[in-house]
């Protein structure tokens, strides 16, 4: 025997209390598949969330974040505050990356500068709060006769004191 509810299309529900007739989902609800006995409640994009796609009778609303925030989690389940490049978000708010670390995005965490010596290379360009170091060839890699490059010592960036 075929389930009579299987004939109910998306956007409707199969009414348990009325001889399993197909009824449209009420306002602010939806059913994305056929044969459902209940309609799901539409997501509401409130506060720091804003509506990217309105709820319809067959699909849920989709949210993104207001300017200054970015989405986290499946389906943008959370909004997290943006920070500037060279910063990371802590419990106390946006904090500058500590010396020896950088962040080139407006979200995420500060990451350590690359250690060029691990690859037998030298530092070509110093790192900053916003940028990683640039590694260059080691002196041994330079071809004979080529002008020698003296890598600068990893100098502290002005205003970027150790913490």
């Amino acid at each position: 025997l075929q389930d009579p509810c299987s004939n109910c299309p998306a956007g409707t529900f199969c009414d348990n209390n009325r001889n399993q007739i197909c009824s449209p989902c009420p306002p602010n609800s939806f059913s994305s598949a056929g044969g459902q006995r209940t309609c799901d409640i539409c997501r509401q994009c409130k506060g720091v969330f804003r509506t990217r796609k309105e709820c319809s009778s067959t699909s849920n609303a989709e949210c993104d974040c207001t300017p200054g925030f970015h989405c986290l989690g499946a389906g943008c389940s959370m909004c997290e505050q943006d920070c500037k490049q060279g910063q990371e978000l802590t419990k106390e708010g946006c904090k500058d990356c500590s010396f020896g670390t950088f962040n080139d995005e407006e979200h995420g965490v500060c990451r350590p500068w690359t250690d060029c010596s691990l690859d037998g290379k030298s530092v070509l360009v110093n790192g900053t709060k916003e940028r990683d170091v640039v590694c260059g060839p080691s002196p041994a890699d330079l071809s004979p006769g080529a002008s020698s490059v003296t890598p600068p010592a990893p100098a502290r960036e002005p205003g970027h004191s150790p913490q």
Epitope: F13, P26, C39, I41, Q44
Partner: antibody
């Protein structure tokens, strides 16, 4: 058609606890189900609901503290992720009968289980 | 989130009398009508009395009557019996994916 909760016990703060709601005479895919609790000397408090399709909705205070899930067509679970002494209460599971035929949760909670007692203490 | 404010407890009346409990919502419930009333006795689960503001739940005596719309609702118990001594709660349904339901604080009915 009936509902029964189980799994309530004494736990220490921070120890996750999962309560089970077992239904008979109907399928969880046909109705919304709700979890409600009552702390000693306090009123009824709505925790959250699950739709027939398995979507979950929580009270704002309960988000992140509780997880509702369906483990079969007749068993529903409520996980208290990190209980505190404030979570000491009788926990009830109930079906939303939707007797008016809205197609979603309407607050016509019936039947209810007898409840299961959770005590959080160190 | 919405708030449901019930008549302060306790409300007392004699056997055979009538009590009226009010439930005031800070925002209108869905469809102006999705409000339920429950009876709660110690050691027992809540019992559905009224749904959709005024519909009597199955097996509930007609002495219980629900009325109201939007933000103002009332439960009236007439021909009061000693067995009606309990705490009564209203709950409203809201158009939200969080705080979809809100319970009132409860009203204790004392039967003298």
């Amino acid at each position: 058609q009936s509902v029964e909760e189980s799994g309530g016990r004494l736990v220490t703060p921070g120890t996750p606890l999962t309560l089970t709601c077992t239904v008979s005479g109907f399928s969880l895919s046909d109705y919304y189900m709700t979890w409600v609790r009552q702390a000693p000397g306090k009123g009824l408090e709505y925790i959250g609901i699950m739709s027939g399709s398995g979507s979950t909705y929580y009270a704002s205070w309960a988000k992140g503290r509780f997880t509702i899930s369906k483990t079969s067509s007749t068993t529903l679970e409520l996980k208290i992720t990190s209980p505190t002494t404030e979570d000491t209460a009788i926990y009830f599971c109930a079906r939303d009968g939707d007797y008016a035929g809205w197609g979603y949760a309407t607050g016509a909670f019936d039947p209810w289980g007898p409840g299961t007692l959770v005590t959080v203490s160190s | 989130a919405a708030v449901l404010t019930q008549t302060p407890s306790p409300v007392s009346a004699a056997v055979g009398g009538t009590v009226t409990i009010s439930c005031q919502a800070s925002q209108s419930v869905v469809g102006n009508s999705l409000l339920s009333w429950f009876q709660k006795k110690p050691g027992q689960p809540p019992k559905l009395l009224i749904y959709s503001a005024s519909s009597l739940a199955s097996g509930v005596p007609s002495r219980f009557k629900g009325s109201g719309s939007g933000t103002q609702f009332t439960l009236t118990i007439s021909d009061l019996e000693s067995d009606d001594a309990a705490t009564y709660y209203c709950t409203g349904r809201y158009n939200s994916d969080t705080d979809t339901f809100v319970f009132g604080g409860g009203t204790e009915v004392v039967v003298k």
